[in-house]
Amino acid sequence: KSPVFGPQEVSSVEGNSVSIKCYYPPTSVNRHTRKYWCRKGASGRCITLVSSEGYVSSNYAGRANLTNFPENGTFVVNIAQLSRDDSGHYKCGLGINSRGLSFDVSLEVSQGPELPNGTEVYTVDVGRTVTIKCPFKTENAPKTKALYKKIGQTSVLVIDSRNYVNPNYKDRIRLRIPGTGQLIFTVVIDRLRLSDHGLYLCQAGDGSNRDEKNADLQVLEPEPELVYEDLRGSVTFHCALGLEVANVAKFLCRVNSRETCDVVINTLGKRDSAFEGRILLNPQDKDGSFSVVITGLRKEDEGRYLCGAHSDGQLQEGWPIQAWQLFVNEESTIPRSPTVVKGVAGGSVAVLCPYNPKESQSLKYWCLWEGAQNGRCPLLVESQGLVQEQYEGRLSLLQEPGNGTFTVILNQLTTQDAGFYWCLTNGDTRWRTTVEIKIIEGEPNLKVPGNVTAVLGETLNIPCHFPCKFSSYEKYWCKWSNTGCQTLPSQDEGPSEAFVNCDENSRLVSLTLNPVTRADEGWYWCGVKQGHFYGETAAVYVAVEEKKVAGSRYVSPAKADAAPDEKVLDSGVREIENKAIQDPRLFAEEKVVADTGDQAGGSRASVDSSSSEEQGGSSK
């Protein structure tokens, strides 16, 4: 018995389309093997019509395709513009046509329903507009024009030229009679309902001389478009409802178990709290189309979504809709990364952002989600170096660790930084992800002076205290610019007095600028990392002024005689519960040796090899 399964019988009518789904056990071999749709001939051979390898027979050219969905063990054969000749016996299968992994399908294409001669068929989606054309002869030009709906053996008047409108069509129907010379009147019905479906009769005049024309109106509920997206990834619903509703409020809703539709987001400012921080409704175009982006997809986001237009911003019968069925694939290509990153006021966070590894050259961005109205996400930083002004000196986007992940570092945190941020690229939009930054109680682990004033031509030494738990990490100093943070040589100076409870493992790493030049003015970061994975950072601003008094200047750590413009830091240490930074599994084992060459406009700093780092405590 074949493990492939599908419909044993499919019936449709001429001119229509079918979408035949075949199911197979989603083993690794089955997922990747050839899928086919073939027609059984009199000889018993099965001639391939379409396959997953791109083959399409001449008979099917331009009207058929085969799509494989390996994650749920399905492939779908779509065939359009059916004719009676398509009736026959087929197989959908895996591998080679003559082997046993297949399922027999019988396709029957019939002529379609018997309609009165000369009946015009109108096929329109629910909520849309139909224009029924009704021709008449010259002698009936002055006579009454009318449209009837046939219900069983009776005809019910819908509208006529004497201003009668059937209550079921109130405010959504009009009869238009053109100027002289045009022998046709039209009936326009807006906001079509499923109940409008049926046979209509146009009539002009009365008695035996009247003109009649039959119209078959087929009102279709839009068939949902199947959308398959990866867990943790992103989906975009593009909604084009037509110009008629360009100025009407728009919405996206999700169908619930009661078959009603709960608003997910609308243009009136409503948003489902389950999508907080991970949804945007993009402003509509002139044609009234809009799109909704949802990131950080969860399994529970699966379901049927409808977009529509109505002044209430929610689903109402007879208004245009578009439908999707969203599936969230748990076998995701998008790697797990923390959805919540915690930092302390004054401290920092390092956020790991996934991107499609095939798109290493794509531009990387980080934006701040704002929930007001339809939501927006203004860019804060991008890989080419643009940084929003108010983030100068405290935000950097690094290409490391690479191979599908980039890093964003934000320091000098305040409670205002709490919120949702999106990682995105100018490439594959499905890889947009969301991270929430939470500001928790605690003290920063790295301690640097407050803003420092350096004297031109002299030596400046800036200390950075780190606790024992960072002893096995690589320490670095870098000079911040809006294109990144350029690593500088630094010096490990042994034990620090700032962490009295950490014994000899509490250390100091210093940056020496000698001699200080004008180019040295700016932001400097002290940080820790392991391999290409970044941990905490602390920032200090160095201002450069003209020489007043001779002598070298040393910014002393936590001493009573500190210069007045230097802030003395609290010595309390608290571990930040930040998985993106602290999880040791995220760190590579190898150490990167800091470049000790000339940096920062000629200022020279050397690493004192005699004070190289000892193996301290563990990284936790």
Epitope: E9, S12, I20, E223, S257
Partner: nanobody
Framework: EVQLVESGGGLVQTGESLRLSCAAS????????MAWFRQVPGKEREFVAA??????????YSADSVKGRFTISRTSPKGETYLQMNGLKPEDTAVYYC??????????????????WGQGTQVTVSS
């Protein structure tokens, strides 16, 4: 809310026929799958047959165990669903359930894909 009510079950002899009906009330979508499952006490629900209406095309599925004997049919996307059971055997004895899902998603044989279920009707085939 969609309600499903089955009828037509009963006691028959081997080789005889029965016709089960499933009436759906409440909102029904034009893209809809209706199915019949059966269950014997102590065993899992077993797929019997399904019919899908998508647009104006119909798709009929059935389990190997009933192929050629049972036929599922539906008069229209909004009409009743029937299961015509011919050549009944004692092993067909079970409670037969009508199920529905809209829109049409997932494998029709998988009971988890259906979001509406009837109360069931008993079919007993005696030898």
């Amino acid at each position: 809310e969609v309600q499903l009510v089955e009828s037509g079950g009963g006691l028959v002899q081997t080789g005889e026929s029965l016709r089960l009906s499933c009436a759906a009330s409440g909102r029904a979508f034009s893209d809809l799958r209706m199915a019949w499952f059966r269950q014997v006490p102590g065993k899992e629900r077993e797929f019997v047959a399904a019919v899908e209406w998508r647009g104006s095309s119909r798709y009929y599925y059935s389990a190997d165990s009933v192929k050629g004997r049972f036929t599922i049919s539906r008069t229209s996307p909004k009409g009743e669903t029937y299961l015509q059971m011919n050549g009944l055997k004692p092993e067909d004895t079970a409670v037969y359930y009508c199920a529905a899902v809209s829109p049409v998603v997932g494998d029709p044989r998988n009971s988890d894909t259906y979001n509406y279920w009837g109360q069931g009707t008993q079919v007993t085939v005696s030898s």
